[in-house]
Interface confidence: medium
């Protein structure tokens, strides 16, 4: 009998409010044994897949999708889904990325840290970011 796949979670580092031109990394998490994570935008209108899956904990795996320099076009809702043979999971909750003009003012925080959506509401753990250098720098054109 096939197992029921838990919904993935999605989070953004350093947060969901990103200054124009800064970087953001979406972190998708699911159970161990995931073959492929997919980051989707706006009801599957655009997406990107990766097999660069690392083990985040004994019971969780994760994939990271980085945008080096965000633009207004990167703003919007994102969600994760994963493929664990032989089937796809349900989608995570949406996470809304906001892109703001850099104000330069010391009083306004640049990001909202620890923003996440999904069954596990907690910040992502950077200590498990052991993926290959080749996966660094997901350019904006990959995502829209």
């Amino acid at each position: 009998q096939e197992e029921d796949l838990p919904r993935p979670s999605i989070s953004a580092e350093p947060g969901t409010v990103i200054p124009l031109g800064s970087h953001v990394t979406f972190v998708c998490r699911g159970p161990v044994g995931v073959q492929t994570f997919r980051l989707e935008r706006e009801s599957r209108s655009t997406y990107n897949d990766t097999e660069d899956v690392s083990q985040a904990s004994p019971s969780e795996s994760e994939a990271r999708f980085r945008i080096d320099s965000v633009s207004e076009g990167n703003a919007g809702p994102y969600r994760c889904i994963y493929y664990k043979p032989p089937k796809w999971s349900e989608q995570s909750d949406y996470l809304e990325l906001l892109v703001k003009e850099t104000s330069g003012g010391p009083d306004s925080p640049d990001t909202e840290p620890g923003s996440s959506a999904g069954p596990t509401q907690r910040p992502s753990d950077n200590s498990h970011n052991e993926h290959a250098p080749a996966s660094q720098g997901l350019k904006a054109e990959h995502l829209y």
Epitope: T36, Y47, N48, D49, D52, A134, L138, E141, H142
Partner: antibody, heavy 120, light 110 residues
Amino acid sequence: SSSVEESGGRLVTPGTPLTLTCTVSGFSLSSYVMGWVRQAPGKGLEWIGTISIRSNTYYASWAKGRFTISKTSTTVDLKITSPITEDTATYFCARGAGNVYYSDYYFSLWGPGTLVTISS
Amino acid sequence: ELVMTQPPASVSAAVGGTVTINCQASQNIYSNLAWYQQRPGQPPKLLIYKASTLASGVPSRFKGSGSGTDYTLTITDLECADAATYYCQTYYNMMDDGAAFGGGTEVEIK
């Protein structure tokens, strides 16, 4: 410079398993996905399958069960498990453009091909 | 199953002219499309990827366009060396026949 070259193509009788080998140089198979594509005489290109850097394999629906793709550190093999006459074709090995994202799974580097003839 | 349709099977044009080759996917492939040129007796050569990005060393006479399910390869200022068969290929979803090729379009130069 980077290159790929196929070998192992020959005349075999139907039902006789055949393994084709793709030997790569100038790049690492740990950094690129690889695929196999075939072309029957006078016909178009047919994607058979792709193997990722993590050795996950993806096959065309018609190729599942008939072909097996595997790899070592320097070679990528295509096994035709039980050839039929319709498998007569030139078989190309091709390197994907990238390694992680499926959006880089188009083929940027091709070998010259190896001819397989299945006949009794 | 993802199917790529590439009509017509052949097209003829004069040197210096323009030729347009179409490719249609059976579902939205979100610009995950490549174009290849294959001359007789040679392996295919990558021309365009991500629907409109020119591969390294490919002349700007080759232009890819399109989105969703419909894509086009346009070759302007045709040269004799452009006589070849052109194939579209998607790499949309590796779980579902994701690297399917179109049937090819042969370009004849008059």
